[in-house]
Interface confidence: medium
């Protein structure tokens, strides 16, 4: 999916993986983005290598709820924030108007079944305009050195682990074939690099109730949630994880 | 339902400005995301952007920015897209079109037809 | 942007004849963010299909959706004279908005 890379800076796509064995997978952020006072920016999760089912999506800001994307349910916007986010695009959530107090921790809050809660953080800082702009300017500069310094620190990696195999080979000269007819077997069976998001399988998730692991609230609480607040659904999440 | 009403065709010249307007009625307007949308003659559908009339919040495809400007009057839940400094390339029919907290334009205004002609 | 292609851009069918017209994405979205409207000349388009295979209200049950990732069909069991019109795929899943380019579809 491109959308999950929609506003990514140069650290690149952020990954929550989580502790737990059984729970296989992962929260792709935006990470940690910046934005001009007054503008807005989208924010977007992602949920990857699982084919649990997504039951729903909340957006936190510290702890404070901001919107809930429901599977049977659709959205709701919490109304102290309804004229300044936006729903979407996809299961993203639009900030807009924003200001210096918006600067914080973001959170998005898979819940499925059977994984149980995935959680992933956006860092978002709002920078007043020129502060913005200033920051543009040595971005690039940084970017360009950081680049160079890359390069440089490759190229020695790859002239040592040459020369290191260089010396390998005279000694294990008499095994080459042993080895190559083991190394032949195990391109065989080798998991692939992972594929870069919008090729990987999409698994479409089914509903399967409003109970995820909600935070110190139970089941009987939640749906006093949706039944107090005034619930809006024209039309359903996009519910889906992508298995890669 | 919301039902969206569209102003009347509008000839303009080159470099003037346009405001056209899309009237809401049967729904809680304020809470519906009215869509503008750009179809040139014999050709497909192109998104401008949106306006929340609750707060007035805009979001635009990057390639209108400074090209339109969308405004709400609650008092009378209507939405206006001002176009600026107009050229043929903005001769088309501008569609407004609504969406709640779904996914899809399920309300669709009938449609307002630019033309700009010295 | 995400860039949707549509095949064929122009086709005539026979009263009776199964029509598929399809939609390609560029970059894999989830179905629910796949939408199609039709558009008769003169008139502005309707809600057809959204995510992926819901008909909207009061379309015929002669129409289908389907498809997943990048690849999105839009399809007419049996093909009538009132279903001659302009067909739209639209994606919501990232911003810009995105349509396809439309498919024309006559009858024979």
């Known amino acids: 999916m491109r959308w999950c890379l929609l506003l990514i800076w140069a650290q690149g796509l952020r990954q929550a993986p989580l502790a737990s064995g059984m729970m296989t997978g992962t929260i792709e952020t935006t990470g940690n983005i910046s934005a001009e006072k007054g503008g807005s920016i989208i924010l977007q999760c992602h949920l990857s290598s699982t084919t649990a089912q997504v039951t729903q999506v909340n957006w936190e800001q510290q702890d404070q709820l901001l919107a809930i994307c429901n599977a049977d349910l659709g959205w709701h916007i919490s109304p102290s924030f309804k004229d300044r986010v936006a729903p979407g695009p996809g299961l993203g959530l639009t900030l807009q108007s924003l200001t210096v107090n918006d600067t914080g921790e973001y959170f998005c809050i898979y819940h499925t079944y059977p994984d149980g809660t995935y959680t992933g953080r956006i860092f978002l800082e709002v920078l007043e305009s020129s502060v913005a702009e200033h920051g543009a300017r040595f971005q690039i500069p940084l970017l360009g050195a950081m680049a160079a310094t890359l390069v440089v620190i490759c190229t020695a990696v790859i002239v040592v682990v040459a020369l290191t195999r260089k010396k390998k080979a005279l000694r294990i000269h008499s095994v080459e074939g042993d080895l190559r007819r083991k190394s032949a077997g195990q391109e065989e069976w080798s998991p692939s690099a992972p594929s870069p998001p919008g090729s990987c399988v999409q698994a479409e998730a089914a509903p399967a109730g409003l109970c995820g692991e909600q935070r110190g609230e139970d089941c009987a609480e939640l749906h006093d949630y949706f039944n107090v607040l005034s619930y809006r659904s024209l039309g359903n999440c996009s519910f889906f994880t992508e298995t890669g | 339902q919301v039902q969206l009403q569209q102003s009347g065709p509008e000839l303009v010249k080159p470099g003037a400005s346009v405001k056209i307007s899309c009237k809401a009625s049967g729904h809680t307007f304020t809470d519906y995301y009215i869509n503008w949308v750009k179809q040139r003659p014999g050709q497909g559908l192109e998104w401008i952007g949106w306006i929340f009339p609750g707060s007035g919040n805009t979001y635009f495809n990057e390639k209108f920015k400074g090209k339109a400007t969308l405004t709400v009057d609650k008092s009378s839940s209507t939405v206006y897209m001002l176009l600026s400094s107009l050229t043929s390339e903005d001769s088309a029919v501008y569609f407004c079109?609504?969406?709640?907290?779904?996914?899809?334009?399920?309300?669709w205004g009938q449609g307002t037809t630019l033309t700009v002609s010295s | 942007e995400i860039v949707l292609t549509q095949s064929p851009a122009l086709m005539a069918a026979s009263p009776g004849e199964k029509v598929t017209i399809t939609c390609s994405v560029s970059s894999s979205i989830s179905s629910s963010n796949l939408h199609w409207y039709q558009q008769k000349s003169e008139t502005s388009p309707k809600p057809w299909i959204y995510?992926?295979?819901n008909l909207a209200s009061g379309v015929p049950i002669r129409f289908s959706g389907s498809g997943s990732g990048t690849s999105y069909s839009l399809t007419i069991s049996s093909m009538e004279a009132e279903d001659a019109a302009t067909y739209y795929c639209q994606q919501w899943s990232s911003y810009p908005l995105t349509f396809g380019g439309g498919t024309k579809l006559e009858i024979k």
């Open positions: 995510g992926t295979s």
């Open positions: 079109a609504g969406y709640g907290l779904g996914h899809y334009f399920d309300n």
